[in-house]
């Protein structure tokens, strides 16, 4: 058993049929010695008396909020949560496996630049009685500070018969140098509690590997006189690290016909313009990627060829 | 039929071309190592991230763009006098060129060159003959060092009398290649910045 936060405790249980469970001793936080009784949750049934209560925790029915009273007055609470371990593996029932970039990916994180700011998100089908708490650090043995905000519900989607909920959190490394060469990864730890079930999820990464620039901005077409050609131009996104001559981007330019069957025409370039022949009903798209370290491409910025 | 590869026009910062070749070569070599050594811990997640230049050179700090010098987190051990030798500088004088920047890059390259050559000598003794260092990568390191044109004592190749442990050597190769790729990215950023200055 260990303390998650004040008056909230996690009991780690090997989860198999007829498992012996875990013996837990609760102590009432009071100077009083006599006349103390214990109850569980809303029940008025007295479970025991005295300053301590010993219980055998085997299943969710044994978890919950234990309260010690004296003469009708509440003295203190202890909330017991269960963390299940099945076949030596901690349960992952609360969050959905996103399977990207590999199986057992429950947390996904992205950064728009090298400032040390990043966003992580996760998915669940659970809609109520759910809380998350996020901690992060750079390295684990001698951790350096990363500050995370509160996790918030950021999107709801319907997937077949199920509703899916996306939660996200923003974190900022306390003292980040955009030009630094990372040797210790960022560690992100999410505590998830659904009713009386506790689970924890972790992710470890270098900022350089989770970079995904915003799409190029101000994508514009300028017709060239006396020809079918147009000059396509774009700019670095505002959120990208500066100076741009140091943190350079490379771009992928694509011309796509209206029909998805038509072959896409694409090139890569370090420039912020290209000459394009505009076909009727075609669209021109541009996306960005760090020029020197191949992390994710941005989403496409697109403009119709009208 | 291949023409001789075009060199950048004389007005262009001469080392940019070489640094781009360096990043390409080390990235290709790392990819080859990951594939060839698929049953060894050779991915970014599996290896320990070591920097053989740590406490010996200060490339990141010395080559910091002017715009980042206001960032307290970037100013660990900053030197501020200016570089004056080295052919990559051509005739440009810019406050970005602090002492240590290009000479620090040169020292990085020299250290990695020695490590890679020593390692290659060991790998050539491996009866499995599983992996060797790409000669192109070694040549590109040499070209960039020549373009930087710093006079520096030659470091003798390390020789070892004991029987090499080929498993450890291959893991060390992965660690070195990962670290060198990260440094090659920094070098490319620096050269790009200098070229734009």
């Amino acid at each position: 058993i260990w303390e998650l936060k004040k008056d909230v405790y996690v009991v780690e249980l090997d989860w198999y049929p007829d498992a012996p469970g875990e013996m837990v001793v609760l102590t009432c936080d009071t100077p009083e010695e006599d006349g103390i009784t214990w109850t569980l949750d809303q029940s008025s049934e007295v479970l025991g008396s005295g300053k301590t209560l010993t219980i055998q925790v085997k299943e969710f029915g044994d978890a919950g909020q234990y309260t010690c009273h004296k003469g009708g007055e509440v003295l203190s609470h202890s909330l017991l949560l269960l963390h299940k371990k099945e076949d030596g593996i901690w349960s992952t029932d609360i969050l959905k496996d996103q399977k990207e970039p590999k199986n057992k990916t429950f947390l996904r994180c992205e950064a728009k630049n090298y400032s040390g700011r990043f966003t992580c998100w996760w998915l669940t089908t659970i809609s109520t009685d759910l809380t998350f708490s996020v901690k992060s650090s750079r390295g684990s043995s001698d951790p350096q500070g990363v500050t995370c905000g509160a996790a918030t519900l950021s999107a709801e989607r319907v997937r077949g018969d199920n509703k899916e909920y996306e939660y996200s959190v923003e974190c900022q490394e306390d003292s980040a140098c955009p030009a630094a060469e990372e040797s210790l990864p960022i560690e992100v730890m999410v505590d998830a509690v659904h009713k009386l079930k506790y689970e924890n999820y972790t992710s470890s990464f270098f900022i350089r590997d989770i970079i995904k620039p915003d799409p190029p901005k101000n994508l514009q077409l300028k017709p060239l006189k006396n020809s079918r050609q147009v000059e396509v131009s774009w700019e670095y996104p505002d959120t990208w690290s500066t100076p741009h001559s140091y943190f350079s981007l490379t771009f992928c330019v694509q011309v796509q016909g209206k029909s998805k069957r038509e072959k896409k025409d694409r090139v890569f370039t370090d420039k912020t313009s290209a000459t394009v022949i505009c076909r009727k009903n075609a669209s021109i798209s541009v996306r960005a990627q760090d020029r020197y370290y191949s992390s994710s491409w941005s989403e496409w910025a697109s403009v119709p060829c009208s | 039929r291949n023409l001789p590869v075009a060199t950048p026009d004389p007005g262009m910062f001469p080392c940019l071309h070489h640094s781009q070749n360096l990043l390409r070569a080390v990235s290709n070599m790392l990819q080859k190592a990951r594939q060839t050594l698929e049953f060894y811990p050779c991915t970014s997640e599996e290896i320990d991230h070591e920097d053989i230049t740590k406490d010996k050179t200060s490339t990141v700090e010395a080559c910091l763009p002017l715009e980042l010098t206001k960032n307290e987190s970037c100013l660990n051990s900053r030197e501020t006098s200016f570089i004056t030798n080295g052919s990559c500088l051509a005739s440009r004088k810019t406050s970005f060129m602090m002492a240590l920047c290009l000479s620090s890059i040169y020292e990085d390259l020299k250290m990695y060159q020695v490590e890679f050559k020593t390692m290659n000598a060991k790998l050539l003794m491996d009866p499995k003959r599983q992996i060797f260092l790409d000669q192109n990568m070694l040549a590109v390191i040499d070209e960039l060092m020549q373009a930087l044109n710093f006079n520096s004592e030659t470091v003798p190749q390390k020789s070892s009398l004991e029987e090499p442990d080929f498993y450890k050597t291959k893991i060390k190769l992965c660690i070195l290649l990962h670290a060198f790729r990260i440094r090659a990215v920094t070098i490319d950023r620096v050269m790009s910045y200098l070229n734009a200055s």
Epitope: Q229, V255, V267, T269, A274, V276, I277 | R1, Q31
Partner: nanobody, 127 residues
């Protein structure tokens, strides 16, 4: 292996026009970016224009923008460089080169590092 042959060069007066052709044999050019380079005596070789595999995206150096047009006919396995308003400074040997689009290196359209090269055709612009 792609073999490239340039044609269409010659002597022309300033202000005149020429159309260079680059024909490929040995393999289809459909999956290749194709570029036209030039090298004047005593000068560096430079990329003049390049065209994407589908022909819809192009790159030109500033000095030829609005005067030169690169195009391709994939059915004929040929790439063209239409040169109008020629100037004496356009005098050079013009080379055609091809770069495989889906190579691991993911080469840029403005790159000067091409896989296959032709022998070149001389263009001379007299004043």
């Amino acid at each position: 292996e792609v073999q490239l042959v340039e044609s269409g060069g010659g002597l022309v007066q300033a202000g005149g026009s020429l159309r260079l052709s680059c024909s490929a044999s040995g393999r289809s050019l459909n999956d290749y970016i194709v570029g036209w380079f030039r090298q004047a005596p005593g000068k560096e070789r430079e990329l003049v224009a390049a065209i994407s595999s589908g022909g819809y995206i192009q790159h030109y150096i500033d000095s030829v923008k609005g005067r030169f047009t690169i195009s391709r006919d994939n059915a004929k396995n040929t790439v063209y460089l239409q040169m109008n308003g020629l100037k004496p400074e356009d005098t050079a040997v013009y080379y055609c080169a091809a770069n495989q689009l889906n190579g691991v290196a993911r080469k840029k359209i403005e790159s000067d590092d091409y896989d296959y090269w032709g022998q070149g055709t001389q263009v001379t612009v007299s004043s």
